[in-house]
């Protein structure tokens, strides 16, 4: 590779989370080189003996890739030439947390960065109205969570107004045993008013919210990663 | 264009083998994972296994172990399912699919026409 | 192994209905579920990937969703070119597995 141990390249990672069950996507990135045949990609996991993922001379190269993570892993080939060294990773499992390497090589020189990759469950909560309740209440489901998240209420007109006390969490294991499915009801709620839904653990923050009024209900929910970037 | 063309109809007696090929071309045969799934007359699809042909690597249906080899010639860009001990519950056609995804094992998204095995006394 | 559990193995139906068809999981939690369209002497068509990603080149009418172990297919309206056996897969883990099969036949 003649100047490759001379110089270094820019290698530049995210630290991201995988929500289990999903694809999941390990980003790196580098200094593009037009020589596709002269780039290497390796992704190595710490603690694990063999590769995670090879792509060299322009194809994948997986003769030494670590069992577990066989059939699971592929680079996003016509984008290396670009400098997209990401990986994406099928079926993303809580034993696929972990520091990982991504080392690259190409005509201009090497260079590589780590990640930290997280692992869990998150997910949108819907908020409806809840008209078998005896009073007027909000009912705040999200299907998949993991590690067990806490949850809070708010609104727009009590604003810095504590709900545990006329709120009920409660948090039913799915099928799989490891994700939750989260149930958040509030009492007593009033009309003409915007509630939100916040369900969050160390991986994701998410939030539902709903404006119930006279003549309709208006919803809206999003999901943010935390520590990602 | 990805092209997955199999071998002709094979009539076997039981107890013999068979050997179904499968030449791909319109693509980087090492690159994606080939997948072989069967159908007996008038019944459902059955996944049978499925091979990396950039390593050789393999995967089989538990109730076919031992019984069903998947190879591969790379040089030919050809996979191969060979299965033995042939009985007449064998009898299906038997159909050679590649794996969207490349090296990441995704569903069945180009098939072979298919092969008949007749397995009968 | 997972196990896919399809229902129903066999419905009638007119042109311009709406088609229902599910699979159950026996186990676990992964979108990796696809489903194909297979026409007598032909081989499986995919129709869709990843619980609900639809195949370039396929019609919009064909749709999927699901999560958790219950998957479904739906065609929002029928058209003739439709009446075929229709099957789930789950590709998720190390062994693949189909449904076993769901026939859409004309009323």
């Known amino acids: 590779f003649g100047i490759s141990g001379k110089h270094f390249i820019t290698v530049t990672t995210f630290t991201s989370a995988g929500n289990i069950g999903e694809d999941g996507t390990l980003s790196c990135t580098f200094e593009p080189d037009i020589k596709l045949n002269g780039i290497v990609i390796q992704w190595l996991k710490e603690g694990i003996k063999g590769l995670v993922h090879e792509f060299k001379e322009g194809k994948d190269d997986l003769s030494q890739q670590h069992e577990m993570f066989r059939g699971r892993t592929a680079v996003f080939a016509d984008q290396v030439v670009v400098g997209n060294a990401s990986l994406r990773l099928k079926n993303v499992q809580l034993t696929d947390a972990g520091t990982y390497t991504c080392y690259i090589r190409t005509s201009k020189g090497k260079g590589n960065a780590n990640l930290e990759y997280k692992t869990g469950a998150f997910s949108m909560p819907e908020i409806n109205v809840d008209y078998n309740a005896s009073s007027e209440s909000l009912r705040c489901e999200a299907p998949r969570w993991f590690p067990q998240p806490t949850v809070a209420w708010a609104s727009q007109v009590d604003q810095g107004a504590n709900f545990s006390e006329v709120s009920n969490t409660s948090f039913e294991l799915n099928s799989e045993n490891v994700t939750m499915k989260v149930v958040s009801v509030l009492y007593n709620v009033t009309i003409n008013n915007t509630y939100s839904c916040m369900i969050e653990n160390d991986i994701a923050k998410a939030t539902g919210d709903i404006k119930v009024t006279d003549s309709e209900v208006k919803r809206r929910s999003q999901l943010q990663l935390l520590n990602s970037g | 264009e990805v092209q997955l063309v199999q071998s002709g109809a094979e009539v076997k007696k039981p107890g013999a083998s068979v050997k179904v090929s499968c030449k791909a071309s319109?693509?980087?045969?090492?690159?994606?994972?080939i997948g072989w799934v069967r159908q007996a007359p008038g019944q459902g699809l059955e996944w049978i296994g499925d091979?990396?042909?950039?390593?050789?690597?393999?995967n089989y249906n538990e109730k076919f172990k031992g019984r069903v080899t998947i190879t591969r010639d790379t040089s030919t860009s050809t996979a191969y399912l060979e299965l033995s001990s042939l009985r007449s519950e064998d009898t299906a056609v038997y159909y050679c699919?590649?794996?969207?995804?490349?090296?990441?094992?995704?569903?069945?998204?180009?098939w072979g026409q298919g092969t008949l095995v007749t397995v009968s006394s | 192994d997972i196990q896919m559990t399809q229902s129903p193995s066999s419905l009638s139906a007119s042109v311009g209905d709406r088609v229902t068809i599910t699979c159950k999981a026996s186990?676990?939690?992964?979108?990796?579920v696809a489903w194909y369209q297979q026409k007598p002497g032909k081989a499986p068509k995919l129709l869709i990937y990843?619980?609900?990603t639809l195949q370039p080149g396929v019609p919009s009418r064909f749709s999927g969703s699901g999560s958790g172990r219950d998957y479904t297919l739906t065609i929002s309206s029928l058209q003739p070119e439709d009446f075929a056996t229709y099957y789930c897969?789950?590709?998720?883990?190390?062994?693949?597995?189909f449904g076993q099969g769901t026939k859409v036949e004309i009323k």
């Open positions: 699919a590649r794996l969207d995804g490349s090296s990441y094992r995704g569903a069945m998204d180009s």
């Open positions: 319109g693509y980087t045969f090492t690159s994606y994972w």
């Open positions: 091979i990396y042909p950039g390593g050789g690597y393999t």
């Open positions: 186990q676990g939690f992964n979108k990796y």
């Open positions: 990843y619980t609900s």
């Open positions: 897969l789950q590709y998720g883990n190390l062994l693949y597995a």
